[in-house]
């Protein structure tokens, strides 16, 4: 009698144990469910908010041309400023011509005065030559008015209507560059 | 999320392409960049691409690296050419979307005779 006993309290808690585990496995089931939902919301928004916004550029940034243009708020190195701009999806400001130089020192003189920003040029330390980010030359007219003494990185920024030199660890604002979405219309 | 793959020993004046593919996980990548980090130094960043498809290299890299991606923009690819000894570090994929930062685990490039 002890035995069968023994036996059904034994038996008892194996099917315990059973409903424990399909417990918990339903649990993290459910919690796996819930995580994919909000990566699967998350993407539908993301997806709804480009659909909605149609503009060739976004919010805050300006257009001109091909081209949309962010002009930073914050001071940070040049280092720092290339990441921040990676993460808006753009690059550092490479200007291709004097129109395109024009257009940022005009709109520069309305939106702040006569600040400092980084743009996408650097001087290479062993040739000494100044490339843009994407690895090409900048036109004659467009190389930096005066060659920083620095004996550290150097790198490329826009004042009032110059292209200067300074040392890369230097603080200043900084223009992120991307295309502009062409309208499907 | 983000797995490298593609290192290797190489001789000097070598080859290698680095491959980073994203899995579904990761979200609004704006764009996406390889770092490296050499024993006792920073890790720096040594070239990325923009969901655009624009490039940026470090002043180091210059002319023997290039960065490309696949047409889904899941993988993204670093072919380095007429590679130096100074190129010698642990490569990471990174995803740059506007909140989080995503890294890979990283993968070895040595440059040895």
């Known amino acids: 009698k002890l035995l069968q006993v023994s036996t059904i309290a034994m038996q008892q808690q194996e099917k315990l144990i059973q409903q424990e585990r399909a417990l918990l496995n339903f649990t993290e089931w459910k919690r796996s469910c819930a995580l994919q939902m909000k990566y699967c919301q998350a993407f539908m928004q993301n997806s709804l908010s480009s659909a909605h916004n149609s503009s060739p550029c976004p919010n805050n940034w300006i257009q001109n041309r091909e081209s949309c243009y962010y002009v930073s708020e914050i001071w940070s190195i040049w280092h720092t400023s290339q990441e921040n701009c990676l993460k808006e999806g753009s690059t550092l400001l490479q200007i291709e011509s004097k129109e395109e130089m024009d257009f940022i020192t005009g709109s520069l003189r309305k939106i702040k005065g006569s600040y400092d920003y980084w743009v996408g040029l650097s001087q290479d330390g062993h040739s000494g030559r100044w490339l843009w980010q994407d690895g090409s030359s900048p036109s004659p007219g467009l190389l930096p008015a005066e060659r920083s003494q620095s004996a550290n990185q150097v790198c490329g920024y826009v004042k009032s209507n110059s292209l200067l030199s300074s040392n890369c660890s230097t603080w200043k604002y900084f223009i992120c560059e991307k295309y502009a979405l062409r309208s499907s219309v | 999320q983000l797995q490298e793959s593609g290192g290797g020993l190489v001789q000097p004046g070598g080859s290698l392409r680095l491959s980073c593919a994203a899995s579904?996980?990761?979200?609004?990548?704006?764009?996406m960049g390889w770092y490296r980090q050499a024993p006792g130094k920073q890790r720096e960043l040594v070239a990325a691409?923009?969901?655009?498809?624009?490039?940026t290299y470090a002043d180091s890299v210059k002319g023997r690296f290039t960065i490309s991606r696949d047409n889904a923009g899941n993988t993204v690819y670093l072919q380095m050419n007429s590679l130096r000894p100074e190129d010698t570090a642990v490569y990471y994929c990174?995803?740059?979307?506007?909140?989080?930062?995503?890294w890979g685990q990283g993968t070895q490039v040595t440059v040895s005779s």
């Open positions: 579904g996980r990761i979200f609004s990548v704006n764009a």
């Open positions: 691409i923009t969901n655009q498809g624009a490039p």
């Open positions: 990174k995803a740059f979307t506007r909140g989080d930062d995503y």
